[in-house]
């Protein structure tokens, strides 16, 4: 059987000879050289060599436990002559013993960490970790202890865990933001002779809201012209806050002052400035100076710092309104006037009034914007603003005239303003009614008396207030002995009725009926329209079959005896 124990070998051997490991030996070995010892497995023939006659094993190279702590090899004892094993192949272990040849190494060369400013003493910042490649199961070669080399009295480190904590009360970022801490890790439990490594921890204090906003001055003064429209920025104010980020965000508001309704303050998120803007139209002539109380406050407040005082500040803003030479102002935004269409030239329609709002009260002159009255239908008295006609009007041509009147300061022609005038032309009964269409109808030869052969409609260009009322009648010259009658329906329509039984187209092929249409307005207007009635042959249903061909071709050359 084999005779050996586990082999142990000290790492990092520095001797000049090969390092002796141990001896493989079989009790079958008679010592006569008849056995050959063979080594195989981890490092055999390279790291470990065997004297094949004696079984002595040597290490040829310096071994590092941290690279490989255990080597597993196999041993054979073989009869040199026959190759026959005298023992079963057996596995054995060479264990490398540790020496303290590795310093602790931090997982990072440089750590970065943050901790809020004003943190309580003992607040966790970061944990650093150093590892030692030496054997943790043997001695203290890998027992690491942490200590702080640089960074006191601000920070401390727990010797066992490497946890870095704050060590000083009220560390203020606004005073100092960056700290460089150097931590040492030493093996051998920190004892003398232990190996050590260091790391740098860059610690940044993060901001908390421990500073209120402050205006650098108590009073601000701005000027703005009275003409500034709503939304016009008139000045910027800025409170400063020693904090950063959202802790330095500022909201501005107007809390008091007679300009409370006239001005607004908006916060510029980029610059953290308060922009004073015009809220309502200003009038120098009414009020020349406004004062406002503007407040700057932090929107996000940490309750634990409220003892430091309110997280807001206020300043007075004085706004001076500057006079502006303003254009004349009309008494109305628009004027609506009316005039009858039968008005004579130079008829006055109405008047406009404009005044200079400035204290100087400069006189104004009036004119018509000719781009809006190309036909020069209207004119204006430049002194008093009276509007009058300069041409005859016709409602039926144009109902509304939209013109623009200009008021200009006499002393400063650059100052002018405009107003729209809407002139409505009122109706006058100056148009006679007439047929709605050209009427050409027919009557059947076999028609019976009082048969309706056509309904008449009339139109009138006028637009009477109470609506149209038309009356229809045969012209006096045709009234007696007519073959047809006109029946007024009293609804602005009339019917043509047959007056006899039967018509002979060979005797009379066409009748022309003169019809008088009158309106009911003042003065009464009337016109005469002619209705053409042709005599046609019809079927028994009354449908036209044929008419006198000439009636279609020469209606004017026909007899007028109706």
């Amino acid at each position: 059987s084999w005779m050996w124990n586990q082999f142990f070998l000290l790492e990092e051997y520095t001797g000049s000879d090969y390092q002796y490991v141990g001896k493989l030996h079989s009790d079958q070995d008679r010592g006569d050289g008849s056995l050959k010892y063979i080594l195989s497995g981890d490092g055999a023939g390279d790291l470990f060599i065997i004297n094949e006659n004696t079984g002595d094993i040597q290490a040829t190279k310096r071994l590092d436990r941290e690279e490989k702590p255990v080597y597993i090899l196999r041993a054979q004892a073989i009869n040199r002559r026959t190759g026959r094993p005298v023992e079963p192949e057996s596995e054995f272990i060479i264990k490398i013993h540790d020496i303290n040849d590795n310093e602790p190494i931090f997982t990072k060369e440089v750590y970065t960490a943050t901790v809020p400013e004003m943190s309580d003493v003992g607040t966790f910042v970061v944990q650093v970790t150093a590892t030692d490649a030496d054997d943790p199961t043997y001695g203290n070669s890998a027992k690491v202890v942490y200590s702080i080399l640089q960074g006191q009295p601000y920070f401390s480190v727990e010797s066992e865990t490497g946890i870095i904590k704050t060590a000083l009360l009220n560390m203020d970022r606004e005073n100092r933001e960056q700290y460089q801490v150097v931590i040492q890790a030493k093996d051998m439990g920190g004892q003398m002779g232990g190996l050590s490594g260091t790391t740098t921890v860059n610690i940044t204090l993060t901001d908390v809201n421990d500073n209120p906003p402050r205006f650098p001055q108590s009073t601000y003064q701005f000027k703005t012209p009275e003409s500034s429209p709503p939304g016009t920025p008139i000045g910027r104010i800025k409170a400063s806050d020693a904090d950063v980020g959202e802790n330095a965000e500022i909201e501005y508001s107007i809390t008091d002052g007679e300009g409370l309704d006239m001005f607004d303050v908006i916060t510029d998120q980029e610059t953290q400035e308060g922009i004073i803007t015009v809220k309502k139209l200003l009038d120098f002539e009414k009020k020349k100076v406004y004062t406002l109380k503007v407040e700057a406050s932090n929107p996000y407040v940490e309750p634990r710092f409220l003892y430091l005082g309110p997280f807001k500040d206020s300043a007075t803003v004085r706004i001076v309104v500057e006079d502006v030479d303003e254009p004349p102002v009309f008494s109305k935004l628009a004027y609506i006037l009316q005039i009858r269409e039968d008005a004579q030239i130079n008829t006055t329609i109405g008047s406009v009034t404009a005044q200079d709002p400035d204290a100087a009260r400069n006189p104004v002159k009036y004119s018509v914007d000719r781009h809006t009255d190309m036909d020069r239908i209207f004119n204006i008295d430049s002194g008093n603003g009276s509007i009058f006609t300069s041409k005859l009007l016709d409602r039926e041509t144009l109902l509304w005239h939209n013109i623009t009147v200009i008021a200009t300061e006499i002393n400063n022609p650059k100052q002018s303003s405009r107003v729209p005038l809407y002139i409505k032309v009122l109706d006058v009964n100056d148009n006679a009614p007439e047929f709605a269409e050209f009427y050409e109808t027919f009557v059947c030869e076999k028609a019976k008396a009082d048969q309706l052969i056509q309904t008449l409609h009339a139109v009138d260009k006028d637009d009477p207030y109470s609506g149209h009322q038309f009356s229809f009648s045969l012209a006096p010259e045709a009234a007696s002995g007519s073959n047809f009658t006109i029946q007024d329906n009293k609804d602005n329509t009339a019917g043509i009725l047959t007056r006899k039984n039967g018509y002979n187209r060979h005797e009379m092929s066409t009748y022309l009926l003169p019809v008088v249409i009158s309106d009911n307005d003042y003065p009464v207007q009337s016109s005469t329209g002619t209705v053409t009635v042709r005599v046609c042959a019809c079927d028994h249903h009354g449908n036209m079959q044929s008419c006198h061909a000439e009636a279609l071709i020469h209606p004017t050359g026909l007899s007028t005896g109706a």
Partner: antibody, heavy 117, light 111 residues
């Protein structure tokens, strides 16, 4: 380079003896056993015996035990095989071969021994 | 004595084809996982040449188309792809006990 160089061919009378030499070079002669193997014409290989040069320990096959003697001269790294009482069936090529763990890893070129009256 | 029986006596194989030679020992030649069986190649007019030792280990310088396997009493030499230069007689040999004995040989030819 390992080399085994054998002596030349021999023609022998029946009943006589023959001594074949094998000179080794290219390795430590004492560290390896030397074997002798013969091959009759058209036949297979037949192991005859071996010797440990360091102790001159020998092993012979039963068939040749009484007629074969294997010796060495360590000073010249030469092994010898002597076969006595030769008969015609001893006509064969005789090889020396280096032994290592039961295998023959190097062989001599062979010596032809002819036994004829 | 341990008798070594080789089969077949001769073998004709096409170039590039597999050749398999068997060797049976009259008793086990294995001990402690070591198989004391070796294979040789002999070409006409030349001494034998070691191919495989301890049943499956390829001797240095021998092409890897040669391989050996087996244990106890049954062993095999395989030529995976026969080449022209592989024409020879192949012998098995045991070193398990004295006297060391050889098989009768197998002649390998090209078909």
């Amino acid at each position: 380079e390992v080399q085994l160089v054998q002596s030349g061919a021999e023609v022998k009378k029946p009943g006589s003896s023959v001594k074949v030499s094998c000179k080794a070079s290219g390795y430590t002669f004492s560290n390896y056993w030397m074997h002798w193997v013969r091959q009759a014409p058209g036949q297979g290989l037949e192991w005859m015996g071996d010797i440990d040069p360091s102790h001159s320990e020998t092993h012979y096959t039963q068939k040749f035990k009484d007629r074969v003697t294997i010796t060495v001269d360590k000073s010249t790294s030469t092994a010898y095989m002597e076969l006595s009482s030769l008969r015609s069936e001893d006509t064969a090529v005789y090889y020396c071969a280096r032994g290592d763990l039961g295998r023959f890893d190097y062989w001599g070129q062979g010596t032809t021994v002819t036994v004829s009256s | 004595d341990i008798v070594m029986t080789q089969s077949p006596d001769s073998l004709a194989v096409s170039l590039g084809e597999r050749a398999t030679i068997n060797c049976r020992a009259s008793e086990s030649v294995s001990i402690h996982g070591t198989h004391l069986m070796h294979w040789y190649q002999q070409k006409p007019g030349q001494p034998p040449k070691l191919l495989i030792y301890a049943a499956s280990n390829l001797e240095s310088g021998v092409p890897d188309r040669f391989s050996g396997s087996g244990s106890e009493t049954d062993f095999t030499l395989t030529i995976s792809s026969l080449q022209a230069e592989d024409v020879a007689v192949y012998y098995c040999q045991q070193s398990f006990e004295d006297p060391w004995t050889f098989g009768g040989g197998t002649k390998v030819e090209i078909k």
